[in-house]
Amino acid sequence: SERCDDWGLDTMRQIQVFEDEPARIKCPLFEHFLKFNYSTAHSAGLTLIWYWTRQDRDLEEPINFRLPENRISKEKDVLWFRPTLLNDTGNYTCMLRNTTYCSKVAFPLEVVQKDSCFNSPMKLPVHKLYIEYGIQRITCPNVDGYFPSSVKPTITWYMGCYKIQNFNNVIPEGMNLSFLIAFISNNGNYTCVVTYPENGRTFHLTRTLTVKVVGSPKNAVPPVIHSPNDHVVYEKEPGEELLIPCTVYFSFLMDSRNEVWWTIDGKKPDDIPIDVTINESISHSRTEDETRTQILSIKKVTSEDLKRSYVCHARSAKGEVAKAATVKQKVPAPRYTVELACGFGAT
């Protein structure tokens, strides 16, 4: 066979679908690899061919499109399962070709089992809700294209194992689940089950997502530097180890980049000819507020180092702050014994 542009196995598209449910999978060629869409390709006389490799096998084989009730079918650039079976798991390839052109890509499809409480090995998307913020919604994901707009599905929402019905602050509204007010207690997995009829059969789509309640933007503040502060003086003798922690609190802010850094005499530590190490640790509160600690360490401090300016800086989408550490050279204690001896000698 002639050469084919092989994009390999697209592991970025690790597709997971539930057993015994419909699944529609678009050929990734048109979404990620080629600059034209299926309609253009089709008009140009290109044909889309599907085949697969079963789990734990090496042999590529054609997909059987002649199963009872058209269980597997192809429509334009979409491969349909109505419904999936566990042994549909494998690597699927879509190939676009004519006599002069060929391009193909493979992707893994995993058919996953779920229990009666919707627990499964499925990787769940995370939706963040602001704490005590007012109405926010989550939407039943990835159900477009399964049924025409003329079909009115029934949608049932669950939190964990429990149907959401007259929940205190959560209202099911079709494809949406409205949170009148969100609390930490609303953290968890939410499942929508969409039931729709098709050709005399009833199909179910199960979609689960994780809700994480995070700090509200109305409570967000610029970074707060807890350390260094005015109450602590770092007093060292030359030769001792100097350790200065910079501890900064960041309010949760969606898509904000939180940064902490030290400057020594106005320069980055890497640009100063001294042996400095900086270790960072990060902790999060239940609402994903963040505390970052960067410890600046100089193993054997010199008297020159003790005269330098050490400033901790922090930045988030809410603003930038800085705080200098008070560093001093320890003054040797007066040698009282000698002075007293001199005193006695004078009498």
Partner: antibody
Framework: EQSGGGAEGGLVKPGGSLELCCKA??????????RCWVRQAPGKGLEWIGC?????????YYANWVNGRFTLSRDIDQSTGCLQLNSLTAADTAMYYC???????????WGQGTLVTVSS | ALVMTQTPSPVSAAVGGTVTINCQAS??????LAWFQQKPGQPPKLLIY???TLASGVPSRFSGSGSGTEFTLTISGLQSDDAATYYC????????????FGGGTEVVVK
Amino acid sequence: EQSGGGAEGGLVKPGGSLELCCKASGFSLSTSYWRCWVRQAPGKGLEWIGCIYAGSGDVTYYANWVNGRFTLSRDIDQSTGCLQLNSLTAADTAMYYCASGVGFGYFNLWGQGTLVTVSS
Amino acid sequence: ALVMTQTPSPVSAAVGGTVTINCQASEDIYSNLAWFQQKPGQPPKLLIYDASTLASGVPSRFSGSGSGTEFTLTISGLQSDDAATYYCLGVYTHISADNAFGGGTEVVVK
């Protein structure tokens, strides 16, 4: 259950203000619930005013027609909710009920109501 | 804003009979509807929530059905004690959280 409509209500002049309060005794203090207010003009139907979440004074919802004239508040320690009525007109003459429920809008505990008459 | 329309009013039936009250929502409110009963001089009493779930202590002769924009309250085996005004309450959160009562339906027991 729920103690009466709270404030004694009574006669208020047009343009005047009044605060109605009621105390819920059918919920434990640890329970989160909605405290809502509903009014009923003489011989008319029920009209929803608004709701406040008893666990958080920050979250309140009002009917569109309220237009900032009424304010809901709550004192979580005393399990008391209040409705501040401002810029009152004769059209605000009604029986004002406080109602509570674990579900938003599903009020299973009601106060006996407070009659507010706005007249010069 | 959400508008709830109730029909008919008044409605009358004999003891032991069946009464059906309809409630129509101006928006799709899914199953977010409650029914209340109010007798003269008393506060309302919750009968049904989530369109069809019976509230605690409510006799099974009361039933609710419907979803979306059309809802029904049915009282079968009517008793003289059921003479009251019945209100539907819709819950809608499209822009802000909004509750709206229907205009009420008076039930007369003959």
